[in-house]
C-alpha cells in the first residue's frame, strides 16, 4: 500500500507481550494532521478498528485499547491514517507491530550456564526447557523491545530445550523465556521465573543499547 501520506508510527504501551485477559494500548501517531486512524490486524482473526484522531501540538494520534486480551486479538498490527472519511484515503502503513498473548500454557524453566553470575567477558548461555512439547522458545530481556527466538531441540530426558548463547558477558540483566507452538506463533506460554544474570568486574549492571528502541516501540518481525 503506497498511501497518499507518509506512514504513521505505532507503539504498544506498556509493551507488545500481553498477558491473557489484560489490555494493551496501541498508539498510532503522526505529525500529519490525520482525522482518522485505522488499525488493521493480520493473524488468526483479521480485524480493522477505527478511531477519530486527537490533535495536540502538531501531532495527531489515536489510542486503541486492545483487550481483554485473547487469542483472536494477537497478531500483526499496522496503523493507517486518513485525512478524509468517506471515502478513506489511506496513508502508507506503519511498520508492523507483533502483539503476542502470553500466559496460555505452563511456564518453561530458565537456567544459565555456567551460572547466573559470570565474570566480565566470560561466555554465558541461557537454556529454556519444558516437559511441554514447545516448538519454539522466546527469550526476552527486561528493557529490550524484541525477543530472541530459537527452535526447541529434540526431546532429551523428557524435556524440550533451546539454548541461547549470549556470548561474552558485558552487562547483566533480567531474562524470561516463553514457549510457543509452530502453528500459533502469537500465542505464548506463561513466563518462566525471571533469571537475573549478574556480571562481576563490571561497574554497571545496566545494558546500554542506545541504538535499540524502548520496550514501547514496534518490535521487529520475528514470529514468522
Amino acid at each position: 500500500h503506497e498511501g497518499v501520506h507518509r506512514k504513521p508510527s505505532l507503539l504498544a504501551h506498556p509493551g507488545p507481550l500481553v498477558k491473557s485477559e489484560e489490555t494493551v494500548i496501541l498508539q498510532c501517531w503522526s505529525d500529519v494532521r490525520f482525522q482518522h486512524f485505522l488499525l488493521h490486524r493480520e493473524g488468526k482473526f483479521k480485524d480493522t478498528l477505527h478511531l477519530i484522531g486527537e490533535h495536540h501540538d502538531g501531532v495527531s494520534k489515536a489510542n486503541f485499547s486492545i483487550g481483554p486480551m485473547m487469542q483472536d486479538l494477537a497478531g500483526t498490527y499496522r496503523c493507517y491514517g486518513s485525512v478524509t472519511h468517506s471515502p478513506y484515503q489511506l496513508s502508507a502503513p506503519s511498520d508492523p507491530l507483533d502483539i503476542v498473548i502470553t500466559g496460555l500454557y505452563e511456564k518453561p524453566s530458565l537456567s544459565a550456564q555456567p551460572g547466573p553470575t559470570v565474570l566480565a567477558g566470560e561466555s554465558v548461555t541461557l537454556s529454556c526447557s519444558s516437559r511441554s512439547s514447545y516448538d519454539m522458545y522466546h527469550l526476552s530481556r527486561e528493557g529490550e523491545a524484541h525477543e530472541r527466538r530459537f527452535s526447541a531441540g529434540p526431546k532429551v530426558n523428557g524435556t524440550f530445550q533451546a539454548d541461547f548463547p549470549l556470548g561474552p558477558a558485558t552487562h547483566g540483566g533480567t531474562y524470561r523465556c516463553f514457549g510457543s507452538f509452530r502453528d500459533s506463533p502469537y500465542e505464548w506460554s506463561n513466563s518462566s521465573d525471571p533469571l537475573l544474570v549478574s556480571v562481576t568486574g563490571n561497574p554497571s549492571n545496566s545494558w546500554p543499547s542506545p541504538t535499540e528502541p524502548s520496550s514501547e516501540t514496534g518490535n521487529p518481525r520475528h514470529l514468522h
Epitope: D47, F64, S65, I66, G67, M70, Q71, D72, L73, Y88
Partner: antibody, heavy 124, light 108 residues
Framework: QVQLVQSGAEVKKPGSSVKVSCKAS????????ISWVRQAPGQGLEWMGG????????NYAQKFQGRVTITADESTSTAYMELSSLRSEDTAVYYC?????????????????WGQGTTVTVSS | EIVLTQSPGTLSLSPGERATLSCRAS???????LAWYQQKPGRAPRLLIY???SRATGIPDRFSGSGSGTDFTLTISRLEPEDFAVYYC?????????FGQGTKLEIK
Amino acid sequence: QVQLVQSGAEVKKPGSSVKVSCKASGGTFSSYAISWVRQAPGQGLEWMGGIIPIFGTANYAQKFQGRVTITADESTSTAYMELSSLRSEDTAVYYCARGLDTPNVVVKGAFDIWGQGTTVTVSS
Amino acid sequence: EIVLTQSPGTLSLSPGERATLSCRASQSVSSSYLAWYQQKPGRAPRLLIYGASSRATGIPDRFSGSGSGTDFTLTISRLEPEDFAVYYCQQYGSSPWTFGQGTKLEIK
C-alpha cells in the same frame, strides 16, 4: 440510519452455488464489519464468517472454510456471500449483519444491524 | 469451539412477571464478548445486550445482562406482551463465534 438490504430468495440444486448480496446505505461501509449468519428452518443461528471491506480481509468459521467466499465491493457498498457445493442441509435463511462498532468495543462480533434475510432452498 | 447451552429450553410466564434466562459456556468467555438477542418469528434477530451487560441502543431498561466466566444471565424485570419471543446468547471472544440454541419465552 444504516440499513442492510439483501437480495431475493433463491432455489438451487444440490452441488451448485449461490451468491447472496447485502447492500448497505448510510454510514461508512468501508470500515464496517459485515458478517453472515444463517438459520436453518426451526433451528438456531450459525455464524459463517465476515469481512471488513476496506482491506478485503475475511474470516471464516472452520466449518465453512473452502466452501464459502465472502467479498465486498466498496464502490457499491455491497457485501457478498457465495456458498458452493450446496446440499440440502444448506437450506436456510441467510442474514448479513453489521458488527457493533463503538470506540469501547474491540471485537465487532455483536450484531446491531441485520438485513431482512434471504431464503435459500436447496432441492433436487 | 465454545459451546453455549441455554436453559430452560422453554419458559412459560405471564406479562408483568420476571424472566431469568441462563447461558452456560463450555469454556470461559470474557464478559466483554457476550451478547444477547431477541428474535420473533419471520424476523431478523435484534441485539439486546453486548459485553454481557451493556444495553444496545433503544433497548428498554427492563432488559439487563450479567455474569462472567462460564455463566451468564439475561433478566427481563417485568414482562411486556411484546417480550415473548426466542432469546439467543452469543460469544464473540473466540472464533468461530457461536450462539446458544435459544430459549423460547412463551405466554403462560
